[in-house]
Amino acid sequence: QGWQAFKNDATEIIPGLREYPEPPQELENNQTMNRAENGGRPPHHPYDTKDVSEYSCRELHYTRFVTDGPCRSAKPVTELVCSGQCGPARLLPNAIGRVKWWRPNGPDFRCIPDRYRAQRVQLLCPGGAAPRSRKVRLVASCKCKRLTRFHNQSELKDFGPETARPQKGRKPRPRARGAKANQAELENAY
């Protein structure tokens, strides 16, 4: 299994972060990150702008090791986690994702990966076995995407350019590619 410890630049340890370049269509109930609290848009923070560029979202740096079975990268890799809800840049709270900025049937702004960078990683194996290098794709920047509450949730699945995403198998975790488990998790994933 993976080395599931991730560190951001504030040295906060958060186990089992979700994947970014090609997310599964189902998110597990027990691994929600930086979850936005439920609640309506605060009435004293009106925002009716249609310009997504006026919105911003959190980019947290996380460091982790790349693993392939018992083999692990010689050095950790660092990538961004696109965190929390989007809000007007001037009003974005310090607390990560503490405010949901959408009104029930109004626009919804999602903080999602925007650009990726590829990195070649050399793995080291116990016992001196020589593994091959691997290429990984890491989130390089985040963006706000404007959705409406009634948009097809598939928009949230297309974080990366790929369409040939695997589906998560039938382990203890929820099965299948199809529509991945519960929508509340999906809505709060970024």
Epitope: P21, T67, G69, A118, A130, P131, P166, G169
Partner: antibody
Framework: EVQLVQSGAEVKKPGESLKISCKGS????????IHWVRQMPGKGLEWMGQ????????EYAPRFQGQVTISADKSISTAYLQWSSLKASDTAMYYC?????????????????WGQGTTVTVSS | EIVLTQSPATLSLSPGERATLSCSAS?????IHWYQQKPGQAPRLLIY???ELASGIPARFSGSGSGTDFTLTISSLEPEDFAVYYC?????????FGGGTKVEIK
Amino acid sequence: EVQLVQSGAEVKKPGESLKISCKGSDFEIKDYYIHWVRQMPGKGLEWMGQIDAEDGETEYAPRFQGQVTISADKSISTAYLQWSSLKASDTAMYYCAREGYYYDGRDYWYFDVWGQGTTVTVSS
Amino acid sequence: EIVLTQSPATLSLSPGERATLSCSASSSVSYIHWYQQKPGQAPRLLIYSTSELASGIPARFSGSGSGTDFTLTISSLEPEDFAVYYCQQLSHLPLTFGGGTKVEIK
């Protein structure tokens, strides 16, 4: 649609040279390893080698080392497989494949996108 | 080189029957990946990392195993499942495929 599109079928004579191509569509090949796989008529799959188009670094299976050359042009997102002197035994279907990557707290790699294949026939 | 040996070479079964395909590695590998190939088509990913179901693959397919012995199971064969199946290891160079198992209609 994410896909790999390969060049068309080739009919060549022994001793001739050949270069076949594999173009990435809707993704940049420099972000992935691109592999070449041979399938001789009625036989199984054989891995030939791989390239990292970002810097051109290649790896070959021992049996194909020195027999073929793998290259790429990242500016047009295309990988190539070439022969300087074909033999009748090079008659086969050649596939390119992308080594995809996925992460969910654990790292995964697999050949997720395959080209449609290029048939190479070498006959006098 | 890690040699992957698939057995049986041919499996003759009827629709609705259970198919069990084996892949044995000459030395321990972390994961095995399975591909399906139909005549005139490119291979397609079926199972990755030993037991993970790839996109669009029906739940009747499953994978298991560890170390040197791995299995692909098709719980109830459908007409479209008759094809050739290959296992593959990606962890060590040179990358290798098994020789394939042909699942044919009895």
